[in-house]
Amino acid sequence: MSGLGRSRRGGRSRVDQEERFPQGLWTGVAMRSCPEEQYWDPLLGTCMSCKTICNHQSQRTCAAFCRSLSCRKEQGKFYDHLLRDCISCASICGQHPKQCAYFCENKLRSPVNLPPELRRQRSGEVENNSDNSGRYQGLEHRGSEASPALPGLKLSADQVALVYST
């Protein structure tokens, strides 16, 4: 962890600051094991929710989580954690896991005759237990979505219940 938090003589630009972490901030992950949905931030000295960096870069430490997050946003797909891939429900109906139930069963019962609000509910069933940030609805909104998770300390709803397709 040399260089972190240590000052040097002379001015330092942001470029210099980034040179202190040549492969990016997250090379320090090996120093700490964080839950799968989190990464170690060596400047904050704590594990942070991967959700906070999914839009910015695909770091190895958060790659699987960020893929699963974007996969869940696609209708008719689910994230297979064993294959580490986004799978189309259409290709496995008949032998489908529960994550595809809404899709495969709706294929059998065409939703054309359903009222629009029911149609939306059915097609969005996988997302229904969470808001856009992946936080379970019904849980009290505790702090911001980026809230750090020091094991044994307070947990935001993100850390308590990050929506994972299992």
Partner: antibody, heavy 114, light 111 residues
């Protein structure tokens, strides 16, 4: 409940050394860093240094290099700040804080006087 | 070293007033890889230790009232208190996480 507990006050003779303690409860110090900060009315807040209790690595602000030594005992969940060759300049409040500054001890008032 | 300059050094306000505190850094605090600004805001009341209000320049810490808002990027940062309450009277410090330096503080007083 998460807390960082510090001794309230220390009175030490000039030239001597002192070891201030910071005991964490409610979390394991191995999961974060522990920083030490000095606060003097005229100088404001000065970062002394930090320790990574998981591996014992410590880092210091240049000003405190040689003056301060930060250690940690994970078995007692405690971090320490040792200050050597004390002078009146060292008379002030010292805080310990966790990780990104979410939790702070109540501060130890150090008085260096003969 | 990274120098943080806070202004004003003190500010007399009326209860219910909107307050804006400034913090300028001698170098950019934006880490481009994750687009986070490594700047925090702390509150210190007389005889007490510091309380974290904001980190990553704009992320409110757990339990902090939403009248406190952090904004800015790069070198210019602001802490806004939308409607000052009596309990907000304190000294406010900005701090950067690269080398852990603090600003000189802004003292918020009653007018």
């Amino acid at each position: 409940e998460v807390q960082l507990q510090q001794s309230v006050a220390e009175l030490v003779r000039p030239g001597a050394s002192v070891k201030l303690s910071c005991t964490a409860s409610g979390f394991n110090i191995k999961n974060t860093y522990i920083h030490w900060v000095k606060q003097r009315p005229e100088q404001g807040l000065e970062w002394i240094g930090k320790i990574d209790p998981a591996n014992g690595n410590s880092e210091y602000a240049p000003k405190f290099q040689g003056k301060a030594t930060i250690t940690a005992d994970t078995s007692s969940n405690t971090a320490y700040l040792q200050l050597s060759s004390l002078t009146s300049e060292d008379t002030t409040i010292y805080y310990c804080t966790s990780g990104y500054g979410a939790y702070w001890g109540q501060g130890t008032t150090l008085t260096v006087s003969s | 070293d990274i120098v943080l300059s806070q202004s004003p050094s003190s500010l007399a306000v009326s209860i219910g007033e909107k307050v804006t505190l400034s913090c300028k850094s001698s170098q950019s605090l934006l880490y481009s890889s994750n687009q986070k600004n490594y700047l925090a805001w702390f509150q210190q009341k007389p005889g007490q230790s510091l309380k974290l209000l904001i980190y990553w320049a704009s992320t409110r810490e757990f339990g902090v009232p939403d009248r406190f808002t952090g904004s800015g990027s790069g070198t210019d940062f602001t802490l806004t208190i939308s409607s000052v309450k009596t309990e907000d009277l304190a000294v406010y410090y900005c701090q950067q996480y690269y080398t852990w330096t603090f600003g000189g503080g802004t003292k918020l007083e009653i007018k």
